[in-house]
């Protein structure tokens, strides 16, 4: 099946303080390779979260990943704050070898918009 | 410190059941799938089941597929291998080992070993 | 199957490299696994590729490339002794598949 990583939602409003879900989904596994969430865009976008084993704070995977046939890849990011504002993408990353991973596909982005408690 | 602790290896008999047992300590057992790998007398490594880190979804090689059943109980933090109608080719040590995000292996049990004699 | 060298040797000092072929580089990943002695327990020395745990020697590395992967061990020393089996995890089929292991002897 041809691989294509969606994000529903263009934007979501989350109160400061609350949580919210930054949904993401691909349609293969395939080429196999690590899925990442950034903030921003270009050479200065911010790693957020990455399915790799990673421990961040504040920040949970929906569903349980480890499941061999997963492809929901949403996260959850708790006790949000200002600083959390911007578009999120789900980007999805073909295994390199001796070079870095390669970008292959990345979702239309999520804004995340943070309103005042 | 990660430990992995298998039991319940014994001497059974042709067409016995066997349940193993591994108890998980030293990391946060239910965010992490786990595997069985076999090693039979002179013979290599060989995967037998894995599970995902909730229990929901389950995965076995051909050869063991319907005489084996893998589960765990987080609460407990203990994986299973439950083994039915045993043959004189399941004789092996077991062990139990932690998967990494992408399904390879990052920590194993000291294993326990499963004879089948008559 | 994961095809892998029965036997390789080589003085201390040395640098050896153990190959691993037959996976698929759109659909595996592989990692890499001593056994000192039979029956007793693995410990990973690579996987995810190239990825070495926090407690292995840095003369161990891994590459991956192609249908093959590579375990290379610069500087080998005597206690490098062991079996090394390679492992892949298949995205396609769900499945992991071990090699038959490499014998490593230190001359």
């Known amino acids: 099946k041809e691989l294509k990583v969606t994000q529903p939602e263009k934007s979501v409003s989350v109160a400061a303080g609350d949580s919210t879900v930054l949904n993401c989904t691909l349609t293969s596994l395939l080429p196999v390779g690590p899925i990442r969430w950034y903030r921003g865009v270009g050479p200065s976008r911010l790693l957020i979260y990455s399915f790799a084993g990673e421990y961040v704070p504040r920040i949970r995977n929906v569903s349980d990943t480890t499941k061999r046939n997963n492809m929901d890849f949403s996260i959850r990011i708790s006790n949000v704050t200002p600083a959390d504002a911007g578009i999120y993408y789900c980007v999805k990353f073909q295994k390199g070898s001796s070079e870095p991973d390669t970008e292959i596909q990345s979702g239309g982005g999520t804004e995340v918009y943070v309103l005042a408690k | 410190d990660v430990q992995l602790v298998e039991s319940g290896g014994a001497v059974v008999r042709p067409g016995e059941s066997l349940r193993l047992s591994c108890a998980a300590s030293?990391?946060?057992?239910?965010?992490?799938?786990m595997s069985w790998v076999r090693q039979a007398p002179g013979k290599g490594l060989e995967w037998l089941a894995g599970?995902?880190?909730?229990?929901?979804?389950?995965y076995y090689i051909d050869s063991v597929k319907g005489r084996f059943t893998i589960s765990r109980d987080n609460s407990e933090n203990s994986l299973y291998l439950q083994m039915n109608s045993l043959t004189a080719e399941d004789t092996a040590v077991y062990y139990c080992?932690?998967?990494?995000?992408?399904?390879?292996?990052?920590?194993w049990g000291l294993g326990t070993l499963v004879t089948v004699s008559s | 199957a994961l095809t892998q060298p029965a036997s390789v040797s080589a003085n201390p000092g040395e640098t050896v490299k153990i190959t691993c072929s037959g996976g698929?580089?759109?659909?595996?990943?592989y990692g890499w696994y001593q056994q000192k002695s039979p029956g007793s327990a693995p410990v990973t020395v690579i996987?995810?590729?190239?990825k070495r745990p926090s407690d292995i020697p840095s003369r161990f590395s891994g590459s991956a490339s192609g249908s093959a992967a590579t375990l290379t061990i610069t500087g080998v020393r005597v206690e490098d002794e062991a079996v090394y089996y390679c492992?892949?995890?298949?995205?396609?089929?769900?499945?992991?598949?071990f090699g038959a292991g490499t014998t490593l002897t230190v001359l």
């Open positions: 492992a892949g995890y298949d995205g396609r089929t769900y499945i992991n598949t």
């Open positions: 080992a932690r998967e990494t995000w992408n399904h390879l292996f990052d920590y």
């Open positions: 698929d580089w759109y659909s595996t990943y």
């Open positions: 599970i995902s880190a909730g229990g929901s979804d389950t």
């Open positions: 996987h995810s590729d190239d």
């Open positions: 030293g990391f946060t057992f239910s965010s992490y799938a």
